[in-house]
């Protein structure tokens, strides 16, 4: 529907509170370095303007697009050139090029200080003193660090954040109540950000067709009783929502997501039997709940897929008449029968099927040519099954920390050019697949593991894209979205890599390591491990284990010493010498 004033339309649909929150998120995701106060000022100005448009849609500038209004507002920031450099050049462009320009300058790894959590009493005081500012600051800090965070979902996180403080700041033991809740929100938030980043990468790097294929597979697994036409409608609507959010159109995105949740709940009888509880919740909880809802039960007596997609004489006719619709039906039918497969595996099978039809439908005897297409699926299914089995066995044998270390070594040898912080971050996350997925029964392991790995490898891809250093990473990241994980799995040790010069400073540690949390201490040790492999890529597992064991013993010993700093200085030199000898450096 065409509205006289888009800004008035969205303000009325979303309400003032959500409107302001979403504009703040949008601005913080674009101008990630701007101070909080500057953003609040811009948001207030936009809000006041929106209110004038609500009062009179014909008022001056009310007919302008949201991109024009928001872009104009962002371009009023005085320090744009000094703070953002060439991003300021975006302001010389006209819409829609200006918005595209802002999008291209979003930084997945902004140079921002780590968020340090204040004392609980300090946080509770700040919350009570000015609840609105406290919650806005939360939105701002998350949005600027995660420029692709799914905005309507961030509103849900903020609601939970507020609820945590409301409850816990009145509790007898505030810290015991609040800290686990904040930890949970932080971990869920990071996971949510990474999942959304993959959706945006899918849309932006591989196009709408790739995203729609992903959505068909996932929704068909989740709603196996829904008809293909219903799934197709949901896919179209979901694609619109994510295209908008990934494109910075956060008001439209949130509005359309609410409409989609409403539609799903109004039509749950023809979608899924699992939606009842979700649909009784308020809007933000409802949308979140629907997005996370468990797979419905598969319909009984689903016929063989082969009948329509292999045995039928009409395969090539159906394919030629509407290729994407036919492949979509194949994907829908396969996915609804296989909640035990990862989405990426289902997409690989669909791609194999498509390639076979492209070849066979041009052959002299098409049926003879494609008759054995399902046999080609077997190795594609077995590859992730075997990989998950092996890695879960390794995880159960080693535990999470040592499993992460095994992956650190493995990935550093594959792509040693990648920066150490990125290798540590990505390998630690890859390692979390163990505790996240290996506990599941066989039928749930693959969708859990491989789809999670897709999310983590996308982190590597977006970080690497900012500063490309490895052709192998670029190749695996850009050739095929669904084959990224098999591509990385297939990489062997990079024989072309020239080992890094030894630098004793990299292996010099101080007493401050003793006061770090267990997690931070692990990261320090894992950073050292990556550096070791970069210096000695041919080092054996046994050699690396010996050095790491010595290092752990060294840290433990010096942290117990009376004069910690002296211990770290003297014992550290010995450790470096011993390690050099052990590794032949």
């Amino acid at each position: 529907d065409a509205h006289k004033s888009e800004v008035a339309h969205r303000f009325k649909d979303l309400g003032e509170e959500n409107f302001k929150a979403l504009v703040l998120i949008a601005f913080a995701q674009y101008l990630q370095q701007c101070p909080f106060e500057d953003h609040v000022k811009l948001v207030n100005e936009v809000t006041e303007f929106a209110k004038t448009c609500v009062a009179d849609e014909s008022a001056e500038n009310c007919d302008k697009s949201l991109h024009t209004l928001f872009g104009d507002k962002l371009c009023t920031v005085a320090t744009l050139r000094e703070t953002y450099g060439e991003m300021a050049d975006c302001c010389a462009k006209q819409e829609p090029e200006r918005n595209e320009c802002f999008l291209q300058h979003k930084d997945d790894n902004p140079n921002l200080p780590r968020l340090v959590r204040p004392e609980v009493d300090v946080m509770c005081t700040a919350f009570h003193d000015n609840e609105e500012t406290f919650l806005k600051k939360y939105l701002y800090e998350i949005a600027r660090r995660h420029p692709y965070f799914y905005a309507p979902e961030l509103l849900f996180f903020a609601k939970r954040y507020k609820a945590a403080f409301t409850e816990c700041c009145q509790a007898a033991d505030k810290a015991a109540c609040l800290l686990p809740k904040l930890d949970e929100l932080r971990d869920e938030g990071k996971a949510s950000s990474a999942k959304q980043r993959l959706k945006c990468a899918s849309l932006q790097k591989f196009g709408e067709r790739a995203f729609k294929a992903w959505a068909v597979a996932r929704l068909s697994q989740r709603f196996p009783k829904a008809e293909f036409a219903e799934v197709s409608k949901l896919v179209t609507d979901l694609t619109k929502v994510h295209t908008e959010c990934c494109h910075g159109d956060l008001l439209e995105c949130a509005d359309d997501r609410a409409d989609l949740a409403k539609y799903i709940c109004e039509n749950q009888d023809s979608i899924s039997s699992k939606l009842k509880e979700c649909c009784e919740k308020p809007l933000l909880e409802k949308s979140h709940c629907i997005a996370e809802v468990e797979n419905d039960e598969m319909p009984a007596d689903l016929p063989s897929l082969a009948a329509d997609f292999v045995e039928s004489k009409d395969v090539c006719k159906n394919y030629a008449e509407a290729k994407d619709v036919f492949l979509g039906m194949f994907l829908y039918e396969y996915a609804r029968r296989h909640p035990d497969y990862s989405v990426v595996l289902l997409l690989r099978l669909a791609k194999t099927y498509e390639t076979t039809l492209e070849k066979c439908c041009a052959a002299a005897d098409p049926h003879e040519c494609y008759a054995k297409v399902f046999d080609e699926f077997k190795p594609l299914v077995e590859e992730p099954q075997n990989l998950i089995k092996q890695n879960c066995e390794l995880f159960e044998q080693l535990g999470e920390y040592k499993f992460q270390n095994a992956l650190l070594v493995r990935y550093t040898k594959k792509v040693p050019q990648v920066s150490t912080p990125t290798l540590v971050e990505v390998s630690r996350n890859l390692g979390k697949v163990g505790s996240k997925c290996c506990k599941h029964p066989e039928a749930k392991r693959m969708p859990c593991a491989e789809d999670y790995l897709s999310v983590v490898l996308n982190q590597l891809c977006v970080l690497h894209e900012k500063t490309p250093v490895s052709d192998r990473v670029t190749k695996c990241c850009t050739e095929s979205l669904v084959n990224r994980r098999p591509c990385f799995s297939a990489l062997e040790v990079d024989e072309t890599y020239v080992p890094k010069e030894f630098n004793a400073e990299t292996f010099t540690f101080h007493a401050d390591i003793c006061t770090l949390s267990e997690k931070e201490r692990q990261i320090k040790k894992q950073t050292a491990l990556v550096e070791l492999v970069k210096h000695k890529p041919k080092a054996t597992k046994e050699q690396l284990k010996a050095v790491m064991d010595d290092f752990a013993a060294f840290v433990e010993k010096c942290c117990k010493a009376d004069d910690k700093e002296t211990c770290f200085a003297e014992e550290g030199k010995k450790l470096v010498a011993a390690s050099q000898a052990a590794l032949g450096l």
Epitope: D301, A307, D308, E311, D314, N318
Partner: antibody, heavy 121, light 110 residues
Framework: EVQLVESGGGLVQPGGSLRLSCAAS????????MGWVRQAPGKGLEYIGI???????YYASWAKGRFTISRDNSKNTLYLQMNSLRAEDTATYFC???????????????WGQGTLVTVSS | IQMTQSPSSLSASVGDRVTITCRSS????????LSWYQQKPGQPPKLLIY???DLASGVPSRFSGSGSGTDFTLTISSLQPEDFATYYC???????????FGGGTKLTVL
């Protein structure tokens, strides 16, 4: 007992619409391709179309656009929606189960008794 | 696509060997997607033969089918009283939209 029972036939005016039903019992309707065939009084058999196990529909060229085959798996029922009916559509309409699942082989091995549709003003 | 049956009517006696032919205007799918039906007044058709020569379940062995491509034959080796009926051929072609029935052969008592 494995059987097909058609219903919904009757007298309809030219230009009118009618929906025929075919209730299956003793087997799952979605396990085979299901078709509709008609027979005008004193005439031969005429193929209308089929719906495959996966829901693909195929129609004789004369039926395309006016006739629609669908099914409701939960009710184990097959349907034939007929629009813009003409006098020449007067016939007994049979639903039938094809030997194949994904296409029409022309080999229908289970038939209903048929339902008579009369198009007349 | 046309399916032409001949003869359109035929009179014979119990014990006779009877042959009905069916010709299609183009080759049936896989050269063998041809079926034969028997229909008695007031009843639905009954499948006799599928894939040109395979006998449907419960059909007596006196019925047989042969042929390939465009020319097919139904043979009743020794006519029984219950065999007097109308017989139809049906062909499946490269598209499921093109399935077609022959015009029928009415078999009556001589």
């Amino acid at each position: 007992e494995v059987q097909l029972v058609e219903s919904g036939g009757g007298l309809v005016q030219p230009g009118g619409s009618l929906r025929l039903s075919c209730a299956a019992s003793g087997f799952s309707l979605s396990s085979n391709a299901m078709g509709w065939v008609r027979q005008a009084p004193g005439k031969g058999l005429e193929y209308i179309g089929i719906i495959s196990v996966g829901g693909f529909t195929y129609y004789a060229s004369w039926a395309k656009g006016r006739f629609t085959i669908s099914r409701d798996n939960s009710k184990n029922t097959l349907y034939l929606q007929m629009n813009s009916l003409r006098a020449e559509d007067t016939a007994t309409y049979f639903c039938a189960r094809d030997r194949h699942g994904g296409d029409s082989s022309g080999a229908f091995y289970l038939w209903g008794q048929g339902t008579l549709v009369t198009v007349s003003s | 696509i046309q399916m032409t049956q001949s003869p359109s009517s035929l009179s014979a006696s119990v014990g006779d060997r009877v042959t009905i032919t069916c010709r299609s205007s183009e080759s049936v799918y896989s050269n063998n997607q041809l079926s034969w039906y028997q229909q008695k007044p007031g009843q639905p058709p009954k499948l006799l033969i599928y894939d040109a020569s395979d006998l449907a379940s419960g059909v007596p062995s006196r019925f047989s089918g042969s042929g390939s491509g465009t020319d097919f034959t139904l043979t009743i080796s020794s006519l029984q009283p219950e065999d007097f009926a109308t017989y139809y051929c049906a062909g499946g072609f490269s598209s499921s939209s093109d399935t077609a029935f022959g015009g029928g052969t009415k078999l009556t008592v001589l």
